[in-house]
């Protein structure tokens, strides 16, 4: 039982347990497709343990393989809403540094009002993740409908 | 190699590796939108290691941040089925204790027959998670189509 | 701090951190519904740490409970494409050894162009996972649209 106690006494960050779950703060100005996120216990059930927010975008603090997940629901949406305004697409990618820019995850809404997915991907300290919502539809800000998170899985 | 051996000898529960994957048992009576779950090796590939079932609802036994995931498929469903019977919505939330009641995850079927999503959320010992399916459509009981699970991620 | 250093010095495999993320290589010949996967740093952001590929199918090397996740997007697809050619269904299952053959995860596209889901499931060393796409539509090979992965979670 001594090991388990020792494990508890270590700072969790030294074990590499970086994790974050964010809620939508706002969308960008017209020509900026990025979603802007916020997190912290004062806001509800969102949090950042390791990663940080940089102007509403998530910045990674520890190298490793991460599970990235996202759900985005369109505001006041029915199946006809989505089909009237297609294409509405959500892409999650590394947007900085520019040398590492890449799309990690992409989904279109088609006749649905919600997209949700997840994937494993290597991320490096300093990588900033951006979530781009292309199209003219507003996402819901309800915290149970739209959220974005990462979880460090292994070095 | 001694550390890895020591780690194996410790009870897994002391490492906080609580995890559960459940299959649908049945729906509730007419005015009860909750889905009732079951789990255990005798039932197939479902299991509970740490969390428990309380009258078909999942009760958490260890504080921490959890990855909650769910997939629900509607029974004998085609894309037109879902549109015939609006609105069908699935919500996962803490339903007890009442003081911590909150919706964690919400999805509508619109013209689809399956919803699937996942999120990170803090849960506390004693929290009971309920999955509410509003609308009048029966969910599939096939174990590869409808399932619900949690995985402890970090303290 | 000594424990964290010791942890880093151990081979990660001894901690059971098996993980893989694969990208689509190709579909099978006409009567073979299986998707064939590939992975490795030379291919982009896909990787195998522990599991292996056997003729494009993922073989597990360590017993345990795994998080299995998948996203498949149909090529050059609109909501009408999917509805014209239904049923298009994606199933993830253990395909060998034959004695353990079982469907783990099943989703239909209906009027959508992407399916994405995840689940926890026990897997054993030697289990081979197959992903069967039934129907006549080609999946996208874009690495941000179609991917498949597993993550070891606990013994």
């Amino acid at each position: 039982q001594r090991f388990a106690q020792a494990q508890q006494q270590l700072p969790l960050e030294s074990l590499g347990w970086d994790v974050a779950e964010l809620q939508l703060n706002h969308t960008g100005p017209q020509q900026d497709p990025r979603l802007y996120w916020q997190g912290g216990p004062a806001l509800g059930r969102s949090f950042l343990h390791g990663p940080e927010l940089d102007k509403g975008q998530l910045r990674i603090h520890r190298d490793g393989i991460y599970m990235v997940h996202i759900q985005v629901t369109l505001a006041i949406c029915s199946s006809t809403t989505a089909s009237r305004h297609h294409p509405t697409t959500l892409a999650v990618g590394i947007c900085s540094p520019a040398s590492r820019s890449i799309s990690l995850l992409r989904l279109s809404f088609h006749q649905g009002c919600t997209i949700a997915s997840q994937r494993l991907t290597p991320l490096a300290r300093g990588d900033t993740l951006c979530t781009n919502l292309t199209g003219t539809l507003l996402p819901s800000r309800n915290t149970d409908e739209t959220f974005f998170g990462v979880q460090w899985v292994r070095p | 190699q001694r550390f890895a051996q020591a780690q194996q000898q410790l009870p897994l529960e002391s490492l906080g590796w609580d995890v559960a994957e459940l299959q649908l048992n049945h729906t509730g009576p007419q005015q009860d939108p909750r889905l009732y779950w079951q789990g255990g090796p005798a039932l197939g590939r479902s299991f509970l290691h740490g969390p428990e079932l309380d009258k078909g609802q999942l009760r958490i036994h260890r504080d921490g941040i959890y990855m909650v995931h769910i997939q629900v498929t509607l029974a004998i469903c085609s894309s037109t089925t879902a549109s015939r019977h609006h609105p069908t919505t699935l919500a996962v939330g803490i339903c007890s204790p009442a003081s911590r009641s909150i919706s964690l995850l919400r999805l509508s079927f619109h013209q689809g027959c399956t919803i699937a999503s996942q999120r990170l959320t803090p849960l506390a010992r004693g929290d009971t998670l309920c999955t509410n399916l509003t609308g009048t459509l029966l969910p599939s009981r096939n174990t590869d189509e409808t399932f619900f699970g949690v995985q402890w991620v970090r303290p | 701090q000594r424990f964290a250093q010791a942890q880093q010095q151990l081979p990660l495999e001894s901690l059971g951190w098996d993980v893989a993320e694969l990208q689509l290589n190709h579909t099978g010949p006409q009567q073979d519904p299986r998707l064939y996967w590939q992975g490795g740093p030379a291919l982009g952001r896909s990787f195998l740490h522990g599991p292996e590929l056997d003729k494009g199918q993922l073989r597990i090397h360590r017993d345990g409970i795994y998080m299995v996740h998948i996203q498949v997007t149909l090529a050059i697809c609109s909501s009408t494409t999917a509805s014209r050619h239904h049923p298009t269904t994606l199933a993830v299952g253990i395909c060998s050894p034959a004695s353990r053959s079982i469907s783990l995860l099943r989703l239909s596209f209906h009027q959508g162009c992407t399916i994405a889901s995840q689940r926890l499931t026990p897997l054993a060393r030697g289990d081979t996972l197959c992903t069967n796409l039934t129907g006549t539509l080609l999946p996208s090979r874009n690495t941000d649209e179609t991917f498949f992965g597993v993550q070891w979670v606990r013994p």
């Epitope: - | 509607l74 029974a75 004998i76 089925t81 015939r84 019977h85 609006h86 009048t136 459509l137 029966l138 | -």
Partner: antibody
Amino acid sequence: QVQLKQSGPGLVQPSQKLSITCTVSGFSLTTYGVHWIRQSPVKGLEWLGVIWTTGVVDYNAAFISRLNITKDNSKSQIFFKMNSLQTNDTAMYYCARNSYYGNLYVMDYWGQGTSVTVSS
Amino acid sequence: DIVLTQSPASLPIFLGQRATISCRASRSVSASGYTFMHWYQQKPGQPPKLLIYLVSNLESGVPARFSGSGSGTDFTLNIHPVEEEDAATYYCQHSREFPLTFGAGTKLELK
């Protein structure tokens, strides 16, 4: 309590149109679908179609070309129209409520029936 | 279409005995973890009345002497002990897909 009351003519000329109204009480047409079934000594019970809460209708393919089912939620009424009746359409016509589960497709309450004879 | 074949067409039976009515489907009526077979009772001059849904679930208010069983394509309605008020025609119905179809009926007659 749940009731379905049917009204319509008993006698229809061959090639003419049949119209039946089903007025429901004790439940809302925005919550429950309503089926139409007919019964004859020769063919037994035949399912004709169903109108759902959204107004979407599913028809038996054998009758789709001459059947029209509509409703008025505010009046709690469902309207059944069948064209081009022949003598073999002589039957008892029923409306029946779909059970609570929309994809279970069972009828838990039935109207009293409308006896229809097709004859000149 | 799924064809439902009921047997026997007529079943004469004494009060207090067990009545067994069979229904065979031309193909499986199972899907999504359920079996979509149901039973109705019809008395002369009345509409059918739902007795049992999803093979074995008793509709509210139906006496416990009625029971249903079966799987795949073969199903059975049992009544035990048969009472006088059970004299009626019994129909099976599937709801696996459209069109919904019914069996031709089994007439339960008291001897």
